[in-house]
Amino acid sequence: MAVTACQGLGFVVSLIGIAGIIAATCMDQWSTQDLYNNPVTAVFNYQGLWRSCVRESSGFTECRGYFTLLGLPAMLQAVRALMIVGIVLGAIGLLVSIFALKCIRIGSMEDSAKANMTLTSGIMFIVSGLCAIAGVSVFANMLVTNFWMSTANMYTGMGGMVQTVQTRYTFGAALFVGWVAGGLTLIGGVMMCIACRGLAPEETNYKAVSYHASGHSVAYKPGGFKASTGFGSNTKNKKIYDGGARTEDEVQSYPSKHDYV
């Protein structure tokens, strides 16, 4: 029962985590304009992995996609790659874990196969979560570096007259969504790995017993026979589990009334 709960909870937590990773990847607010001395700004800039946006105090919002691939910073490309890898691994993990769920019966799938699948999905979730956390952290580091660089030359001009105020960017909502989502996916993966240990059948260590039949004698030595768990019994006594799995664009819009809470 505890195994099923752990597996189910791991699946749900990972599902939420992966949904969060997808949401974070699609979000436009990876970096937002720093409102250091002006909490209300007439023009507010924010950027995502795929496009940058400008929201005016008029309510008009304009977003422009990054239509170049070669012209983008290598770090941004790396973050994109990490997030996509995280999503792909997470999606495959979810697919595998659905079939691995103890509460779902698919044909005559053995518990050992479910244990292997649970472990596989768990590892995939862990790697997926790590990819998301790494991607978000790389982007955050890039922001911090740029923030202090732009602070150093915040005011540039001639003869002491302020000409341009450089726009500084700080952490956007997507970073926090990404960190939390990556963490959840990671936790879900660990839970799946823990559940896998419970699903794996224990080796039955029977004592060697000699059965003496009339006429001739046959000695039965115990092997790693599958423990009879779940539905039905292991009538064929096949040695199918040997403990091996037990290791650890451009868009323009005006808002509607519902855009604000």
């Epitope: 800039n45 940058s52 302020v162 808002p255």
Partner: antibody, heavy 115, light 113 residues
Framework: EVQLVESGGGLVQPGGSLRLSCAVS?????MNWVRQAPGKGLEWVAW????????TYADDFKGRFTISRDDSKNTLYLQMNSLRAEDTAVYYC???????????WGQGTLVTVSS | DIQMTQSPSSLSASVGDRVTITCKSS????????????LTWYQQKPGKAPKLLIY???TLESGVPSRFSGSGSGTDYTLTISSLQPEDFATYYC?????????FGQGTKVEIK
């Protein structure tokens, strides 16, 4: 079609108060009050997000003027307190549009502060 | 606050003339996010409310005649009337639309010569 109609202007004594109204019809996301002293240029007074009610004021009017809106009446207000002679002007309500420009203006209402 | 300085404060011109009004801001009005300059131009006739002519420094408001054009970036901007018409005699204002508080130039009065 957006229509803006101001009312509430008139003669008031220095130190007195007055509340201007602007009846709004049509789509308005953010509204402003802009004033123009007789024979002088335009001066922005205040801005309000019509959905959140978030206001912003020019430094000269902070603490004295309050911009607000009534959703049910589709009306924008400017509450003016501690009025001075230099507040004498034609007050316009104006809609902010793409590019942060004022595309629709009311006809204006004259506020005279005099003893 | 961003200061807006218009020049000249007044000018006399004849119908058909090419008129140029300049506006200088104390700070750049160019937004790095979309590479647009947040400067707006208005026309005001006596006893009337101002009329929006140009936004984003060079984008013509719908319904505004094409003889009006705007240019410039950073801190220096220009409004040009290619061929002055009788109805164009008015006062013109530039506006900082980039940051609060929104500020206007002192105005340029275009009079008949």
């Amino acid at each position: 079609e957006v229509q803006l109609v101001e009312s509430g202007g008139g003669l008031v004594q220095p130190g007195g108060s007055l509340r201007l109204s602007c009846a709004v019809s049509g789509y308005t996301f953010s509204m402003n009050w802009v004033r123009q002293a007789p024979g002088k240029g335009l001066e922005w007074v205040a801005w309000i997000n019509m959905y959140t009610g978030e206001p912003t004021y020019a430094d000269d009017f902070k603490g004295r003027f309050t911009i607000s809106r009534d959703d049910s009446k589709n009306t924008l207000y400017l509450q003016m307190n501690s009025l001075r002679a230099e507040d004498t002007a034609v007050y316009y309500c104006a809609r902010l549009v793409k590019g942060n420009g004022f595309d629709y203006w009311g006809q204006g209402t004259l506020v005279t502060v005099s003893s | 606050d961003i200061q807006m300085t218009q020049s000249p404060s007044s000018l006399s011109a004849s119908v058909g003339d090419r008129v140029t009004i300049t506006c200088k801001s104390s700070q750049s009005l160019l937004n790095s996010g979309n590479q647009k300059s947040y400067l707006t131009w208005y026309q005001q006739k006596p006893g009337k409310a101002p009329k929006l002519l140009i936004y984003w420094a060079s984008t013509l408001e719908s319904g505004v005649p094409s003889r009006f054009s705007g240019s410039g970036s950073g801190t220096d901007y220009t409004l040009t009337i290619s061929s002055l018409q009788p109805e164009d005699f008015a006062t013109y204002y530039c506006q900082n639309a980039y940051s609060f508080p929104f500020t206007f130039g002192q105005g340029t009065k275009v009079e008949i010569k």
